[in-house]
């Protein structure tokens, strides 16, 4: 009975040629959308020249699928029983799951304004970003089209700096051709409990974007967990996206297409300030933006973006503390909209639906010698867009999951 | 290749003005912006003037400021420095530089103004 | 106005010397420090940007070091056509400015 059930998973589950497990590893048989809702500023003059709160309109879905790319450069080694891979980033636009096409423009901060006002501030090389500002009349707000946004667009300041810099801008970019890792996982042949936990990435156990436990590499990357999974674990993965290891708590018992699921979620302490879970004191990396140590539901992800402003948050700064949405109007942060979950099926570890969601602000800060930045009279950490990306089983999956899984344990 | 050559220097009396001159070939001046450093005999380096790129802001030394002017000629891709009002204490070997981020990684050869009666 | 403090104002050494020379800031400047060489009669050169950048074409016997206030410039191992006065320079904020100088002579 359930020894031999036991068996069939653990054999199942292991990360190689012929398993159930692998076949979804290598190249998922869920269709994944990223949706994204741009922050589409109303009041850019007011801001620029009288430093008030920041009008902003959500606008959106504008929806891609995603991650329909097989594994790459997909190796065993049979010596420490591990797989490495790379996972191949590409995006299609979906326009009838959209509300607008991908020529449709938003007005957003000047992601190359705010970012080398951030990276460069001495005093110096300012007058001299004023002059390149000023020269191609860039403002401290600009109108891009949601393409240019998202997968870049040349930006008319950074392409007057007289040496060898990268002058594409966009939030993702580069993306598509590009792939993310190179991932090493344990496939499971030894010790079925370590199954697609992540060994090293990029070939480090750690990031070195954090200090102490922070910058540890944990767990798996979120689409599988080792199987036979208790509701009173705490799920521990690595998301590049955020630069960070994170963690999932179980919250309720959910029924997937008929297959029973333990819903997990990313809770508000994960996000919290150190003053109300020490453990998160290494996510606080200066003391000025943070309130020494205070603010909370924001992260500093800039040693991870070359230095650019970059904070990551929950949309609509779901979670944050009140002085970072303070000088932002126009959100409404609600948990069922916009906190990320993850659908497990306990036996096999498998995640069978899944929903990420977060929001990407840049830091943009008062700055003496620029003229578009000169009248701020305090820092903002702007919004420019959230996304969720979804992922579920499909039907034909979700019986065949039925009845050669849960079915036969049930 | 990268070149900048001052002309312009001489003697002059107290008082009396002069205007340097810095042709610039191997780069576009106006992506740059040129700096004036001077260095009086047996002196070290002083900072004097500044035209940052495209045509921006000009900024000068307390010493000189008042007194001198820096401009520049896109379309003769050279710089310029006014002087006037000129005193003892301006002699020296007046040097334009190249720079872009604050460090001067091309220099002219120097051209000497001596102020004396 | 950042003051730029430069130690020694001169120094005599060997061929094959190592050779250290100083620069203090009057106030944090970061890694905006440049170090250059100038010879009698000529026009200074770039050696090292941003405190520790090598400046191309310079021999890798010369590097830079220190971050803030505190400033390095070391020659490993000193040629004859080393001897010559060396500048440090703050590209931080305007005014720049420049040490004194050291003038590195034959011993």
């Known amino acids: 009975g359930d020894l031999l059930i036991q068996k069939t998973i653990k054999k199942q589950v292991v990360l190689e040629e012929g398993t159930i497990a692998f076949k979804n590893w290598v190249k998922t048989g869920t269709e994944v959308y990223r949706q994204f809702w741009i922050f589409d500023v109303q009041n850019p003059q007011e801001v620029m020249m009288n430093s008030s709160n920041i009008q902003v309109k959500q606008r959106g879905p504008y929806t891609y699928r995603v991650r329909f790319l097989a594994k790459e450069n997909v190796t065993q080694d049979a010596e420490d029983n591990t797989v490495s891979f790379l996972q191949p980033n590409g995006a299609i636009f979906e326009p009838s799951l959209s509300v607008g096409t991908e020529a449709d423009n938003f007005t957003v901060l000047n992601l190359a304004v705010a970012a080398a006002s951030h990276i460069y501030q001495n005093q110096f090389v300012q007058m001299i970003l004023n002059s390149l500002i000023n020269k191609s009349k860039s403002s401290m707000f600009q109108v891009r089209t949601l393409r240019e946004l998202l997968w870049g667009y040349r930006d008319p300041f950074l392409s007057l700096v007289p040496y060898p810099v990268t002058t594409t801008v966009g939030l993702f970019y580069p993306y598509n051709n590009t792939a993310d890792g190179v991932y090493k996982v344990f496939n499971g042949k030894d010790n079925i409990s370590k199954v697609a936990i992540i060994d090293t990435y990029k070939g480090k156990r750690n990031l070195s974007y954090w200090e102490s436990h922070c910058d540890m590499i944990n767990g798996t990357d979120a689409a599988s967990f080792p199987p036979f999974v208790e509701k009173s674990q705490v799920l521990q993965f690595f998301s590049s996206d955020i630069c960070r290891s994170i963690y999932a708590v179980f919250e309720s018992d959910v029924n997937l297409k008929g297959i029973p699921v333990y819903r997990f979620v990313l809770p508000s302490k994960a996000f919290a300030s150190p003053v109300e879970n020490p453990d998160n004191y290494c996510f606080c990396t200066e003391k000025i933006i943070s309130k020494n140590c205070t603010s909370y539901g924001v992260l500093d992800i800039s040693k991870c973006k070359e230095g650019r402003p970059v904070y990551i948050s929950l949309p609509h700064f779901l979670y944050a503390s009140p002085d970072v949405s303070e000088p932002i109007d126009g959100l409404n942060p609600n948990e069922e909209e916009h906190r990320t979950y993850l659908d497990i099926e306990p036996i096999t570890g498998f995640t069978l639906q899944f929903a990420k969601r977060l929001q990407v602000n840049l830091l943009v800060k008062p700055s003496e010698k620029i003229q578009v930045l000169k009248n701020l009279k305090r820092n903002y950490i702007v919004p420019i867009l959230w996304l969720n990306e979804t992922g579920t089983i499909g039907d034909e999956k979700a019986n065949m999951f039925r009845s050669q899984v849960t079915g036969k344990i049930n | 290749e990268v070149q900048l050559v001052e002309s312009g220097g001489g003697l002059v009396q107290p008082g009396g003005s002069l205007r340097l001159s810095c042709a610039a070939s191997g780069f576009t001046i106006a992506a740059f912006g040129i700096h004036w450093v001077r260095q009086a005999p047996g002196k070290g380096l002083e900072w004097v003037a500044w035209i940052a790129p495209y045509g921006g802001e000009t900024y000068y030394a307390d010493s000189v400021k008042g007194r001198f002017t820096i401009s520049a000629d896109t379309s003769k891709n050279t710089a310029y420095l006014q002087m006037n009002s000129l005193r003892a204490e301006d002699t020296a070997v007046y040097y334009c530089a190249r720079s872009f981020f604050g460090y001067f990684d091309y220099w002219g050869q120097g051209t000497l103004v001596t102020v004396s009666s | 106005d950042i003051q730029m403090t430069q130690s020694p104002s001169s120094l005599s050494a060997s061929v094959g010397d190592r050779v250290t020379i100083t620069c203090r800031a009057s106030q944090d400047v970061s890694n905006w420090v440049a170090w250059y060489q100038q010879k009698p009669g000529k026009a200074p050169k770039l050696l090292i940007s941003?405190?520790?950048s090598l400046y191309s074409g310079v021999p890798s016997r010369f590097s830079g070091s220190g971050s803030g206030t505190d400033f390095t410039l070391t020659i490993s191992s000193l040629q004859p056509e080393d001897f010559a006065t060396y500048y440090c320079q703050q590209h931080s904020n305007a005014p720049l400015t420049f040490g004194q100088g050291t003038k590195v002579e034959i011993k």
């Open positions: 941003y405190a520790t």
